[in-house]
């Protein structure tokens, strides 16, 4: 297993609409054909997978159907957006790269993205 | 060219096994996915699953979870698709097609499941 | 499972008319592929990534859309467009394709 630096944004605020967006960017030192991109979230000392997807050649990531993540490609950068997100889910949120194919494998994690979500404060009863 | 060449049409029995085979050739084969589709007669399309020729990673649609199992030979650049308890209902045309774009198609296996 | 629902499931129309089909996804996905059959052949790539159209199609075929509401258009039609049209999703898995458009001569 080699290391490979992996960049993110330090800090993200999520939108109005519970979803935040931010760039996941990989040094490759080869042309990887097959990626492996996992979205970990890191609150309170505890890690868990928040999505994964595997991509090849194609720009879109394909997540399983459950998943609160969508993302797309481009060189050695991953877009990725994820949806549905509440205050409760403010916390770090790191990119993990792993260049699966060809050999060598490479496993490179960012540093994390702070997410921060605000619930949006209830409409006021209007008079109309 | 790119091509994606399927092997010939099979008649097996319910409760058997068929496995269909995929041969790539004028591209290369560890870049691409190798899907496979099936086609019931006079019916939709329908995805079982894929695979990343590297690595082998595979992902399956849950219909088939337990009954398909999609392998890959490097070495020949042929990727392979094996369904497993066959019913009647199986009988279809099974194509494989490569990427995530499903740009090129192989030319399809009929598989009749008939007693 | 995202499920695609196409319509019109059947589309009579003739030579040079203009025609649209529409791909309706049960939940926003972020791009959609289309693909062309006729009986007894494999399917072809027509148009991917919502809009861009695939190696070798004619112009006179389009896609647009966005979320959950895609549609292809023919701008001419031509004889041998008379086929049966896939829309598709891979924003997640399963892979979904819609149950098809049957394109017939009128």
């Known amino acids: 297993c080699k290391a490979m630096h992996v960049a993110q944004p330090a800090v993200v605020l999520a939108s109005s609409r519970g979803i935040a967006s931010f760039v996941c960017e990989y040094a490759s030192p080869g042309k990887a054909t097959e990626v492996r991109v996992t979205v970990l979230r890191q609150a309170d000392s505890q890690v868990t997978e928040v999505c994964a997807a595997t991509y090849m050649m194609g720009n879109e990531l394909t997540f399983l159907d459950d998943s609160i993540c969508t993302g797309t490609s481009s060189g050695n950068q991953v877009n990725l957006t994820i949806q549905g997100l509440r205050a409760m889910d403010t916390g770090l949120y790191i990119c993990k790269v792993e260049l699966m194919y060809p050999p060598p494998y490479y496993l490179g994690i960012g540093n994390g993205t702070q997410i921060y979500v605000i619930d949006p404060e209830p409409c006021p009863d209007s008079d109309f | 060219q790119v091509q994606l060449v399927q092997s010939g049409a099979e008649v097996k029995k319910p409760g058997a096994s068929v496995k269909v085979s995929c041969k790539a050739s004028g591209y290369t084969f560890t870049s691409y996915w190798i899907n496979w589709v099936r086609q019931a007669p006079g019916q939709g399309l329908e995805w079982m699953g894929r695979?990343?020729?590297?690595?082998?990673?595979?992902y399956y649609n849950e219909m088939f979870t337990g009954r398909v199992t999609m392998t890959r030979d490097t070495s020949t650049s042929t990727a392979y698709m094996e369904l497993s308890s066959l019913r009647s209902e199986d009988t279809a045309v099974y194509y494989c097609?490569?990427?995530?774009?499903?740009?090129?198609w192989g030319q399809g296996t009929m598989v009749t499941v008939s007693s | 499972d995202i499920q695609l629902t196409q319509s019109p499931s059947f589309l009579s129309a003739s030579v040079g008319d203009r025609v649209t089909i529409t791909c309706s996804a049960s939940k926003s996905v972020s791009y959609i592929h289309w693909y062309q059959q006729k009986p007894g052949k494999a399917p072809k790539l027509l148009i991917y990534d919502t809009s861009t159209l695939a190696s070798g199609v004619p112009p006179r075929f389009s896609g647009s859309g966005s979320g959950p509401e895609f549609t292809l258009t023919i701008s001419s039609l031509q004889p041998e467009d008379f086929a049966t049209y896939y829309c598709q999703q891979r924003t997640t898995y399963p892979l979904t394709f819609g149950q098809g458009t049957k394109l017939e001569i009128k």
């Open positions: 097609a490569r990427g995530d774009y499903f740009d090129y």
């Open positions: 695979i990343a020729p590297g690595s082998g990673t595979t």
